[in-house]
């Protein structure tokens, strides 16, 4: 099933992202990039020794799978 445009309410984005399902929206340059090939380590479980990464999106601005979703570290990436 094709996913419709995904919306972003952070970082001054005026409109839904035009990305197709296989793409991710890169907030630094504000355009879609292929993300299906990226190796994304799983987020550390709660209680891990180092603090969980705090994303710059506020909870009410969460995107993707839903509010409270952990950020996935992508070493280097894109």
């Amino acid at each position: 099933m094709r996913r419709g445009p995904r919306s972003l309410r952070g970082r001054d984005a005026p409109a839904p992202t035009p990305c197709v399902p296989a793409e991710c929206f890169d907030l630094l340059v504000r355009h879609c990039v292929a993300c299906g090939l990226l190796r994304t380590p799983r987020p550390k479980p709660a209680g891990a020794s180092s603090p969980a990464p705090r994303t710059a999106l506020q909870p009410q601005e969460s995107v993707g799978a839903g509010a409270g979703e952990a950020a996935l570290p992508l070493p280097g990436l894109l």
């Epitope: 995904r6 952070g10 929206f25 630094l28 340059v29 993300c35 710059a56 280097g76």
Partner: antibody
Framework: EVQLVQSGGGVVQPGRSLRLSCAAS????????MHWVRQAPGKCLEWVAV????????YYGDSVKGRFTISRDNSKNTLYLQMNSLRDEDTAVYYC???????????????????WGQGTTVTVSS | EIVLTQSPSSLSASVGDRVTITCRAS??????LNWYQQKPGKAPKLLIY???SLQSGVPSRFSGSGSGTDFTLTISSLQPEDFATYYC?????????FGCGTKVEIK
């Protein structure tokens, strides 16, 4: 060990060219975005350029646009900076660095540079 | 271009002191602010990302706070190895920009 080892610096005359290299090891280079950053003697850090993991996108700082080219060879795990029409003000220590990002849902968030090379000195002088 | 202004440009402190460095952005950058430490002749080292997240391996005496335009790096108890220059950097938009640094010297 995650490492970036740089080479290619030196003394060059104004108007000439130079190519810097940055050899990566200890991580999946082909999945990593990369930057060049420079620091003139006694000055602030200045971002030079960034390249996507697959080379599909490149962005440059205004001061080098049209003169410098960032590129990469993923088969050799190496990043390059081709510097043409060099000027006195390009004299600096040049660093390569890995782009640090996180994926939240379908959005890629940028958090700076988490691995740096040792730096290589470029001196532009007649 | 987003301009980052750091203050002070230098400071003198003693081992054990609490040190605070500020970084102000010329426009709102949400929490896309990172802090680096650089020692003479060495490459910068990432300390804090996303304004307040401690990079792996960095001692917990380092902390960051702020959002929007005003940010702070705090060293709770200065150690001998902390004497260095500290830079802020925004990753909100290209061109990426850095502050001009705060040099922490021994009093």
């Amino acid at each position: 060990e995650v490492q970036l080892v740089q080479s290619g610096g030196g003394v060059v005359q104004p108007g000439r060219s130079l190519r810097l290299s940055c050899a990566a090891s200890g991580f999946t280079f082909s999945s990593s975005g990369m930057h060049w950053v420079r620091q003139a003697p006694g000055k602030c850090l200045e971002w030079v350029a960034v390249i996507w993991y697959d080379g599909s996108n490149k962005y440059y700082g205004d001061s080098v646009k049209g003169r410098f080219t960032i590129s990469r060879d993923n088969s050799k795990n190496t990043l390059y900076l081709q510097m043409n029409s060099l000027r006195d003000e390009d004299t600096a220590v040049y660093y390569c660095a890995r782009r640090f990002t996180m994926l939240r849902g379908w959005y890629i968030e940028d958090y700076g540079m988490d691995v740096w090379g040792q730096g290589t000195t470029v001196t532009v002088s007649s | 271009e987003i301009v980052l202004t750091q203050s002070p440009s230098s400071l003198s402190a003693s081992v054990g002191d609490r040190v605070t460095i500020t970084c102000r952005a010329s426009q709102s950058i949400s929490s896309y602010l990172n802090w680096y430490q650089q020692k003479p002749g060495k490459a910068p080292k990432l300390l804090i990302y996303a304004a307040s997240s401690l990079q792996s391996g960095v001692p917990s005496r380092f902390s960051g706070s702020g959002s929007g335009t005003d940010f702070t790096l705090t060293i709770s108890s200065l150690q001998p190895e902390d004497f260095a220059t500290y830079y802020c950097q925004q990753s909100y938009s290209t061109p990426l920009t850095f502050g001009c640094g705060t040099k922490v010297e021994i009093k």
